[in-house]
């Protein structure tokens, strides 16, 4: 079976000549919701962490990356049930003995406080109130993110977003 | 360190009223190259397969999914050195005893011919001439893809791309 691939609108470069730029404001796709500068997709179904990562990837998005405590709180405020948990893009790197975001950066000590073991095959999920680690093979809901950017209708070669 | 996140222009919905649609043709972002309906990013650095998957995800893209032999050939033609190898979005599923694309579909027997072991922790890479399996922990270059779509400047609520 051929791999069927989700689509994502990439940055526009209509032609290579210098033109006037007019930004269009964007909203988020169906099923996604806007939170500050991001579109978030809170899954309803469940997956192991790796499959969640792959699902976001095939949607040309990323498992949620949380910049700071404010963003964590904003995201947790959108979780409507205290019994529901969502994988985010953070797991334990055994070789580096540290929590690592999927973009390669490490968790800084004053960011999220993770309850649970920091060991091999530990991945991180958030609930309405807390941040936990769990075996990555556990099936849970997950959150994908797309950055919400401006698309310029006419752009010059050096004006990529 | 905070997670820094790549941007991707998501589908445009300028307002909720019915408006005229005018498609804009798209080109690929800087560093990416257009191959048919896709934008491809050939990495310069190396990573284990899992980190490559995560990197594409944070770029709001996917590890390369190859539809057929023609696409394989087109991609291989862009590899300028026969000694260079690139991870793609295909690995061995031990539980299902089959090669599996990261979007969940299985490799059909008449698609790619993979040289190497089909076993646990085997991931697939391509070179200028062939398709191989290797331990997923091996560090290699990788290829990310974004689907190249049309963005409509003015869209009605039900006309998401």
């Amino acid at each position: 079976q051929k791999p069927s691939i989700g689509k994502c609108s990439v940055d526009i470069q209509q032609n290579r000549t210098k033109t006037t730029e007019r930004p269009d404001l964007l909203n988020c796709p169906i099923y996604w919701q806007q939170v500050q500068e991001k579109c978030l997709l809170f899954s309803h179904t469940v997956n192991p962490w790796n499959n969640s990562l792959a699902d976001c990837s095939t949607k040309e998005s990323s498992l949620l990356l949380i910049q700071d405590k404010d963003e964590l709180t904003r995201t947790q405020n959108l979780i409507h049930d205290k019994a529901i948990s969502f994988w985010i893009g953070l797991n334990f790197s055994l070789s580096e003995k540290n929590w690592k975001w999927i973009n390669g950066s490490f968790l800084s000590s004053n960011d999220l406080k993770i309850t649970g073991d920091a060991k091999e095959n530990s991945c991180v999920y958030i609930s309405q109130t807390s941040v936990y680690s769990e075996y990555c093979s556990t099936e849970m809901k997950w959150i994908c993110q797309k950055e919400l950017t401006l698309v310029r209708n006419k752009v010059s070669p050096d004006s990529w977003l | 360190q905070k997670p820094s996140i790549g941007k991707c222009s998501v589908d445009i919905q300028q307002n909720r009223t019915k408006t005229t649609e005018r498609p804009d043709l798209l080109n690929c972002p800087i560093y990416w190259q257009q191959v048919q309906e896709k934008c491809l990013l050939f990495s310069h650095t190396v990573n284990p397969w899992n980190n490559s998957l995560a990197d594409c995800s944070t770029k709001e893209s996917s590890l390369l999914l190859i539809q057929d032999k023609d696409e394989l050939t087109r991609t291989q033609n862009l590899i300028h050195d026969k000694a260079i190898s690139f991870w793609i979005g295909l690995n061995f599923s031990l539980s299902e005893k089959n090669w599996k694309w990261i979007n969940g579909s299985f490799l059909s027997s008449n698609d790619l011919k993979i040289t190497g072991d089909a076993k646990e922790n085997s991931c697939v890479y391509i070179s200028q001439t062939s398709v191989y399996s290797e331990y997923c922990s091996t560090e290699m270059k990788w290829i990310c893809q974004k689907e190249l779509t049309l963005v409509r400047n003015k869209v009605s609520p039900d006309s998401w791309l």
Partner: antibody, heavy 121, light 107 residues
């Protein structure tokens, strides 16, 4: 062609068992949660059971809990429903259904043609 | 479980008429509501999802609206092929539930 094809229905006595199968083609089966939905003759639609994409999580309607078991084999692109201790009220056309988006349980954009299960003595 | 109450249970209409069907949820479901059309002997067909999004290939005379607990399916200018039974379905929480159906008949 994108399709779902159910099989395994038939006439069975109360207390008996049947195993329904649903063969999927034309889409990435292993990426989607899947459901069984049934419709008794002349009645409305009733969701029966769902299974996650990886197969590790299952849910059931109260009316079938403890009697029916949903499973899947992603390598064969096939969904199953094992029905035990069948009752007259289980008589229905059984549909398998795929959600529109891989993050969702429902919003079923693809349905099989259905297979009729008749429970009667 | 979330109950969905559809009204009316049946409606008689003529070609060209505007038909409105309502679906009320027993608790708030945000915009997680879908509408299906079913013809005798056939599987249901998805018309509307996420309360107001038209499924690909569905004619634009079908539209959906609402959020929270009250939702509406509207068929503008009813066509002969639209005579069928229509169901709403919530996707907010499991178990997934369907409304009882609305039969659109020829007057």
């Amino acid at each position: 062609e994108v399709q779902l094809l159910e099989s395994g229905g038939g006439l069975v006595q109360p207390g008996g068992s049947l195993r329904l199968s649903c063969a999927a083609s034309g889409f990435t089966f292993g990426q989607y949660a899947m459901s069984w939905v049934r419709q008794a003759p002349g009645k409305g639609l009733e969701w029966v059971s769902a299974i996650s994409a990886a197969g590790g999580t299952t849910y059931y309607a109260d009316s079938v809990k403890g009697r029916f078991t949903i499973s899947r084999d992603n390598s064969k692109n096939t969904l199953y429903l094992q029905m035990n201790s069948l009752r007259a009220e289980d008589t229905a056309v059984y549909y398998c259904a795929k959600p529109l988006d891989s993050s969702q349980w429902a919003d079923f954009d693809l349905w099989g043609r259905g297979t009729l299960v008749t429970v009667s003595s | 479980d979330i109950q969905l109450t559809q009204s009316p249970s049946s409606v008689s209409a003529s070609v060209g008429d505007r038909v409105t069907i309502t679906c009320r949820a027993s608790q708030g479901i945000s915009s997680w509501l879908a509408w299906y059309q079913q013809k005798p002997g056939k599987a249901p067909k998805l018309l509307i999802y996420a309360a107001s999004s038209l499924q690909s290939g569905v004619p634009s005379r079908f539209s959906g609206s609402g959020s929270g607990t009250d939702f509406t399916l509207t068929i503008n200018s009813l066509q002969p092929e639209d005579f069928a039974t229509y169901y709403c379905q919530q996707a907010w929480v499991l178990p997934i539930t369907f409304g009882g159906g609305t039969k659109v008949e020829i007057k």
